[in-house]
């Protein structure tokens, strides 16, 4: 999906209002310095591409993020403010359902959510030069 035509300011507002709080809740008990940010993004469409990938695509050691509260709200925000997004997800979700594992919070998931927090922070500061 090409995130170029999304309403970035409304997605940002939804993130600041509630999605960010859900990410913090998920990470509660974890030190903010515990994980290094290894995933980066260069502009808002790129950030949303990385956010969508880390949130909804199962990875080795962390197959369960798509059912978390922050993921549900992320999906809602992208569907509401990115034209045509929800229609593009139909085939992707059917494939994911077959691979979905039992919901377990692993250290790998915590690391992945830490990366997500970094991507979201970068999304909110689009004018900063890439580190």
């Amino acid at each position: 999906y090409d995130f170029t035509n999304c309403d970035f300011e409304k997605i940002k507002a939804a993130y600041l209002s509630t999605i960010s709080k859900d990410l913090i809740t998920y990470m509660s008990g974890t030190k903010s310095t515990e994980f290094n940010n290894t995933v980066s993004c260069s502009n808002r469409p790129h950030c949303l591409t990385e956010i969508q990938s880390l949130t909804f695509n199962p990875t080795a050691g962390c197959a369960s993020l798509a059912k978390e509260m922050f993921a549900m709200k992320t999906k809602a925000a992208l569907a509401i403010w990115c034209p045509g997004y929800s229609e593009t997800q139909i085939n992707a979700t059917q494939a994911m359902k077959k691979r979905r594992k039992r919901k377990v919070t692993t250290n790998k998931c915590l690391e992945q959510v830490s990366q997500l927090q970094g991507l979201w922070r970068r999304f909110n500061r689009p004018l900063l030069k890439q580190q």
């Epitope: 509630t18 809740t25 509260m69 925000a77 359902k97």
Partner: antibody
Framework: QVQLVQSGAEVKKPGASVKVSCKSS????????MNWVRQAPGQGLEWMGQ????????TYNGNFKGRVTMTRDTSTSTVYMELSSLRSEDTAVYYC???????????????WGQGTTVTVSS | EIVMTQSPATLSVSPGERATLSCSVS???????LHWYQQKPGQSPRPWIF???NLASGIPARFSGSGSGTEFTLTISSLQSEDFAVYYC?????????FGGGTKVEIK
Amino acid sequence: QVQLVQSGAEVKKPGASVKVSCKSSGYAFSSYWMNWVRQAPGQGLEWMGQIFPGDGDTTYNGNFKGRVTMTRDTSTSTVYMELSSLRSEDTAVYYCARSGFDYGYFYAMDYWGQGTTVTVSS
Amino acid sequence: EIVMTQSPATLSVSPGERATLSCSVSSSISSSNLHWYQQKPGQSPRPWIFGTSNLASGIPARFSGSGSGTEFTLTISSLQSEDFAVYYCQQWSSYPLTFGGGTKVEIK
């Protein structure tokens, strides 16, 4: 304007199943999660689960132990909630409720259907 | 499962008086994930307050919400006849989503 119109009242025997529909209009149906909430006579509200019409993704309340199934028909902008193995305690008003971001970007159930009364009686 | 406990179950108030409704949450949640709904007999619930303190569209300013962590409050500064109803708090912090048992505000 956003409207959620539910199917009519149902009377069912214990052990049977019921399927309630909720037809949406006035917004992009595929883009908003739809919840089902029930209310037994004189009681409070109980969340049953939700479905994302865009891809059929669902999240259910474990209290219903596999008895509830939510589906959607994008061609008619309708979501369905089927509850099986009915018992008398399932007698309730069943509501569909869209969830979305309000003007302050808080996420909540912003529009509700009119409710469908389901009576389970032998 | 997060348990929401509302008190009192019934609040008897005279028109013009102040009403304070409480919602206690079994584990701490973000204030952005606590909402209030109003329901009148024979009607569907209506969104009333979003994110602890933000009034839904068209809700009069005599209503206010406050709180954080595990304790939240809905206050009606001067009750009007149309305010008599049941009010439910609800959390959107974790699954399953849960509601409080409701507080019925009735005419004294």
